[in-house]
């Protein structure tokens, strides 16, 4: 992503930052945006990062909330930066294999599962 | 999901069909399937599942390994059904707020995040 | 009011340089990024980066990555477009603009400076 | 890159007529579409942003929508002002991008 801050410290940043403006940010008490209704978060960055681009609309301009949106703009950029990496190398089977062994080891250990 | 069978158990028999099947799923050696290069795999979710159809198209069919793609078909639905419930329910800011906060929380204790 | 004013343009020579400016005042720099685009002689419009002179974070369309180098000073309220190896192809005006930081809409716009390689 | 291509790239009309431009995507741009006008030898103007939003001061003649990939602009009872060079923009995906732009001439 186009900045030297480390994406980690950028995040840790930006939750402070999120409950710093908290109160300014919920001023608006018409506004409706759609929030998902699971905790699997990665499945959700689209709606995530559009529901940030509606917030960001309502909200008065300037000041230090600024720097939160600007930190939320990075974030995105990181998620989409991985994104892009999920189809850029093509390997042999065995190691499309251990990737989906991964993938449905972490879904049977941490995801929430509904019955 | 359209079966009988809960999702957590579906992701367990499906684990261990991969590990019963591997000789099977390998013996074509000149296949490449994309595979993402980082483990936040819930980002990866579509790549993984072309993956999947492009394997099972180069693999021999019948036998029990044909339930082996079943029930990833099974699994694939309960993901698009998830992600359908990503941006369902229309809330106050205050709610999506929150579910801001524990999005970047997580990103923040269990994401492997590249400097 | 927000005022975005654009320097620097004129007539360059084809392999020469020239650093454009932007003077912003109005509102506190610091706050917001702020957006290059070209728009070369009946044409449309192009985006070349933006630079957020808080951070110092700089963010370029591929296209003009070996063209153009954005910077900020802030204390005097300004932005830069620095390109160097002038093309014909790189007569156009260029307008400096503010946007808001996450959605990306340009909602404050300058005046424009024109840059003609000849 | 996201490629935006408007149609039509020019078209005619008169005053109280009322016009349609659109914008169609390469690839999904969410809502993250927005729409400018310019008129010669001025800086453009935002008119409508994240699709439908109308920018302070627009009158309310502009209207948007779409998401996705297909989006378009309204502007009902045509004034005497509104012909000028209509631009759509992405800013969801890298690079930003904008369309080609649609020319509204007088009829």
């Known amino acids: 992503i186009p900045t030297e801050i480390p994406t980690s410290a950028l995040v840790k940043e930006t939750l402070a930052l999120l409950s710093t403006h908290r109160t300014l940010l919920i001023a608006n008490e018409t506004l409706r945006i759609p929030v998902p209704v699971h905790k699997n978060h990665q499945l959700c960055t689209e709606e995530i990062f559009q529901g940030i681009g509606t917030l960001e609309s309502q909200t008065v301009q300037g000041g230090t909330v600024e720097r939160l949106f600007k930190n939320l703009s990075l974030i995105k950029k990181y998620i989409d930066g991985q994104k892009k990496k999920c189809g850029e190398e093509r390997r042999r089977v065995n190691q499309f294999l251990d990737y989906l062994q991964e993938f449905l080891g972490v879904m049977n250990t941490e995801w929430i599962i509904e019955s | 999901i359209p079966t009988e069978i809960p999702t957590s158990a579906l992701v367990k028999e499906t684990l261990a069909l991969l590990s019963t099947h591997r000789t099977l799923l390998i013996a074509n050696e000149t296949l490449r399937i994309p595979v993402p290069v980082h483990k936040n795999h819930q980002l990866c979710t579509e790549e993984i599942f072309q993956g999947i159809g492009t394997l099972e198209s180069q693999t021999v069919q019948g036998g029990t390994v044909e339930r082996l793609f079943k029930n990833l078909s099974l699994i694939k639905k309960y993901i698009d059904g998830q992600k359908k419930k990503c941006g369902e329910e229309r809330r106050r800011v205050n709610q999506f707020l929150d579910y801001l906060q524990e999005f970047l929380g997580v990103m923040n204790t269990e994401w492997i995040i590249e400097s | 009011e927000v005022q975005l004013v654009e320097s620097g343009g004129g007539v360059v020579q084809p392999g020469g340089s020239l650093r454009l400016s932007c003077a912003a005042s109005g509102y506190t720099f610091t706050d917001y990024v702020l957006n290059w685009v070209k728009q070369a002689p009946g044409k449309g419009l192009e985006w070349i980066g933006w630079?957020?002179?808080?951070?110092?974070?700089?963010d370029y369309a591929e296209k003009f990555k070996k063209k153009a180098t954005l910077s900020a000073d802030t204390s005097r309220n300004s932005a830069y477009l620095q390109m160097n190896d002038l093309r014909p192809e790189d007569t156009a005006i260029y307008f400096c603009?503010?946007?808001?930081?996450?959605?990306?809409?340009?909602?404050?716009w300058g005046q424009g400076t024109l840059v003609t390689v000849s | 890159d996201t490629v935006l291509t408007q149609s039509p790239s020019s078209l005619s009309a008169s005053v109280g007529d009322s016009v349609t431009i659109t914008c169609r995507a390469s690839?999904?741009?969410?809502?993250?579409l927005h729409w400018y006008q310019q008129k010669p030898g001025k800086a453009p103007k935002l008119l409508i942003y994240?699709?439908?939003k109308l920018e302070s001061g627009v009158p309310a003649r502009f209207s948007g929508s779409g998401s996705g990939t297909d989006f378009s602009l309204t502007i009902r009872s045509l004034q005497p002002e509104d012909f000028a060079t209509y631009y759509c923009q992405q800013t969801w995906n890298d690079p930003r991008t904008f369309g080609q732009g649609t020319k509204l001439e007088i009829k």
């Open positions: 603009a503010r946007s808001r930081n996450y959605g990306g809409y340009i909602n404050y």
């Open positions: 690839e999904s741009v969410s809502t993250f």
């Open positions: 630079i957020d002179p808080d951070y110092g974070t700089t």
């Open positions: 994240l699709a439908s």
